[in-house]
């Protein structure tokens, strides 16, 4: 059978390297070989092209090199298939070369910030060596933060006669390192060169751009005064290498801003000792560069009625992270304030804390919280400079199966009946949220029963027992994960009762 | 800048081989085709051939087909020229000349300072 | 082989005069000429490629015209540095062939 039409001819001239033409070959069924016809100078000479290899992935393809290629320029493409039973040719296809150019890529030699203009890296680069001189280039340049992964982009050309190979990239974070990569392409091609090494380049320093502050309120003392633990982080956004030298702090009764008290710390959090009325703290963050915005917060009177807005709250774990949802009764409330911290014996020291704006959701990755580990979750309406009731739940990151099972005891033995009786689980043991138990048991060379009952319930009374007859119990505590057994224990139902 | 430098001069007897080196520097060896022009004393300019670097691919006048050799050596950017049985009429001045534009095949932008090989008995 | 005839071999002119060498090709190479000076005991400079391409940092007095067969090189005033050598080249295809040559000389 004659050979398959050549289809979906496709060339790219590799700039004073080669022009390289491909096509998809169809189904040879016997040794095919490939010409390719081209006319060049436009239309004024013509060669051919043929493949010698012996691999038919290689021979969908063929080469021309210099000095038979000429920029601009205008080709024709037509790729002859030959076997023993005749030729085909493929359609003619047209190309023009500076459409189908492709360079190397720009080398980056310098990327530096430029002193006094904020917020802006200049890129200085070679262009490729090898680059058409009668052409003006374009060029891509992409940018991210060393931590990030998503790349931002920004397309711009040059004149060929500018020597001034720099681009200045505005409208950056301050103090913050980018990864730059540049690329280029002959202005009217479709193809562009590789991407160019990274290079690295800071951004220069600013003030620190802002504060985030939260509370926790304590019960007041004997002598009425309250202990409040002021806590603050830089901004959301703020550059991951911002310095900052101190924090200034002010504070005063909202009834009286005369008694305004003041102190400094270079800690991130300060413990303050309050009257039971309102007050309204003041902060700001300071380096050698000069101070931060004011962060501002009110601290409610002890006996005041803070709102309650939140009606149900649930957590969940999807696709590596925990996810918090709630319903709120109040319209007007769209931030709120969440803290987590685990669930420990002792008194909390790693106290987390976030906003959240315009949703009624959040979500952690997995991998922030401790597996196993049970987290207290409590969500603040927040209302202006008002703070609403908070609703707190518990939750997992990731549940295992407990790491032992319940202590079980017996009790009230009796002929048919028994009471089986366990104790909780310690929660550093749990490993996730007890959902329900289950107790086996089983007489001696009998048949094994269970009985499951919600986590709730810490006793069950077995009943239709065999008199006279030794048993073994075991009951078994169970997360999502799966479950654990407590100890087996074994007991005899008594022969009569004393109500028989 | 663009600079082809070529190797010094040589006295060859009849019969004998020369090989003349040109050695670039100032752009992409591999990116550019060398070629080689001869000129006799006071004749005019003789094309010999010419070598593409990035592929090796050469094209050979068939003047001198059977007796000439491109060669280039892509690790040190130099191209060879060596021409055999060596007769006096190929006394001359050998030049290694490099193509320099997108839009003109086979034009000699750049020229080597030229090597005189002197054939003599 | 494209065999390129360079008439006069030589011509005598003086400075400021408009001196004009033409070319010949045995066949058709379209556009594809090249023009050369060579000054004694250099190597040859390329002046016009295309038949009318100035190369770069070419004086604009130096042209080229013509196309097909028939080939010129114009200098429209000629200059105390322009005595020289002048080759026509074709650069259709190889093998290359150069014209015999010209020689300015001062009148």
């Known amino acids: 059978a004659l050979p398959a039409k050549p289809e979906n001819i496709s060339c790219v001239y590799y700039y004073r390297k080669n022009l390289t033409c491909t096509w998809s070959p169809g189904k040879e069924t016997s040794y095919t070989q490939y010409t390719v016809k081209r006319t060049y100078a436009f239309g004024e000479k013509h060669d051919n092209c043929t493949t010698n290899s012996s691999t038919s992935e290689n021979r969908a393809s063929c080469s021309f090199f210099l000095p038979r290629i000429t920029i601009p320029d205008n080709y024709t493409i037509e790729v002859e298939a030959e076997n023993g039973d005749g030729v085909i040719k493929s359609h003619m296809t047209y190309w023009r070369l500076e459409n189908i150019a492709k360079t190397e890529p720009p080398k980056i030699f310098r990327v530096k910030p430029v002193l006094g203009i904020k917020r802006m890296i200049q890129i200085e680069w070679i262009k490729p060596e090898l680059a058409p001189v009668s052409s003006d280039l374009k060029y891509t340049l992409r940018f991210r933060t060393v931590n990030s992964t998503s790349w931002m982009e920004v397309n711009f050309a040059k004149n060929r006669k500018d020597k001034n190979q720099t681009y200045n990239l505005t409208g950056l974070q301050p103090f913050t390192e980018y990864v730059i990569a540049l690329r280029c392409a002959v202005k009217e091609s479709k193809f562009w060169s590789d991407w160019s090494q990274e290079k690295m380049g800071m951004t220069e320093e600013e003030a620190p751009c802002g504060l985030e502050l939260w509370r926790v309120l304590k019960p007041a003392e004997a002598d009425g005064r309250r202990p409040v633990r002021l806590l603050w982080k830089k901004a959301r956004g703020a550059p991951v290498l911002e310095k900052t030298l101190g924090y200034n702090i002010w504070y005063y009764p909202e009834s009286n801003t005369n008694l305004t008290e003041t102190m400094n710390t270079t800690n991130q959090q300060l413990e303050l000792h309050l009257g039971g009325e309102s007050f309204w703290v003041s902060m700001i963050s300071y380096n050698s560069l000069g101070k931060s915005p004011v962060a501002t917060l009110r601290i409610p009177a002890i006996q005041e009625k803070s709102f309650q807005c939140i009606e149900v709250m649930q957590a969940c774990v999807a696709e590596d992270q925990l996810v918090v949802k709630w319903q709120s009764s109040a319209l007007d409330v769209n931030t709120w304030m969440i803290e987590w911290f685990p669930d420990v014996d002792s008194e909390p020291t790693t106290l987390s804390w976030e906003s959240v704006s315009q949703a009624t959701n959040w979500t952690i990755q997995q991998d922030k919280l401790k597996p196993f580990w049970c987290y207290n979750i409590s969500v603040y309406p927040m209302l202006h400079d008002k703070v609403g009731e908070p609703y707190s739940i518990q939750a997992y990151a990731k549940e295992g199966v407990p790491s032992e099972g319940p202590e079980t005891k017996v009790e009230n033995i009796g002929v048919k009946t028994v009471t089986i009786t366990w104790k909780e689980i310690p929660k550093s043991e749990r490993k996730g949220i007890i959902c329900n138990y289950t107790i086996f048991y089983q007489a001696e060379g009998g048949k094994g029963f269970s009985k499951t009952v919600n986590s709730s319930i810490l006793q069950y009374g077995l009943e239709s027992l065999k008199r006279k007859t030794s048993y073994i119990v075991q009951v078994m505590a169970s997360t999502s994960a799966g479950g654990t057994n407590g100890t087996s224990i074994n007991f005899k139902t008594l022969s009569f009762s004393v109500f028989e | 800048q663009v600079q082809l430098v070529q190797s010094g001069a040589e006295v060859k007897k009849p019969g004998a081989s020369v090989k003349v080196s040109c050695k670039a520097s100032?752009?992409?060896?591999?990116?550019?085709?060398l070629n080689w022009v001869r000129q006799a004393p006071g004749q005019g300019l003789e094309w010999m051939g010419l070598i593409n670097p990035y592929n090796g691919g050469t094209d050979y006048n068939p003047q001198f087909q059977d007796r000439v050799t491109i060669t280039a050596d892509k690790s040190t950017s130099t191209a060879y020229m060596e021409l055999s049985s060596l007769r006096s009429e190929d006394t001359a001045v050998y030049y290694c000349?490099?193509?320099?534009?997108?839009?003109?095949?086979?034009?000699?932008?750049?020229w080597g300072q030229g090597t005189l090989v002197t054939v003599s008995s | 082989d494209i065999q390129m005839t360079q008439s006069p071999s030589s011509l005598s002119a003086s400075v400021g005069d408009r001196v004009t060498i033409t070319c010949q090709a045995s066949e058709d190479i379209y556009s594809f000429v090249a023009w050369y000076q060579q000054k004694p005991g250099k190597a040859p400079k390329l002046l016009i490629y295309?038949?009318?391409t100035e190369a770069q940092g070419v004086p604009s007095r130096f042209s080229g015209s013509g196309s097909g067969t028939d080939f010129t090189l114009t200098i429209s005033s000629l200059q105390p540095e322009d005595f020289a050598t002048y080759y026509c080249?074709?650069?259709?295809?190889?093998?290359?062939?150069f014209g015999g040559g010209t020689k300015v000389e001062i009148k």
């Open positions: 000349a490099r193509d320099g534009y997108d839009d003109g095949p086979y034009t000699l932008e750049t």
């Open positions: 080249q074709h650069h259709y295809d190889s093998p290359l062939t």
């Open positions: 295309n038949a009318q």
């Open positions: 100032g752009y992409t060896f591999t990116g550019y085709v």
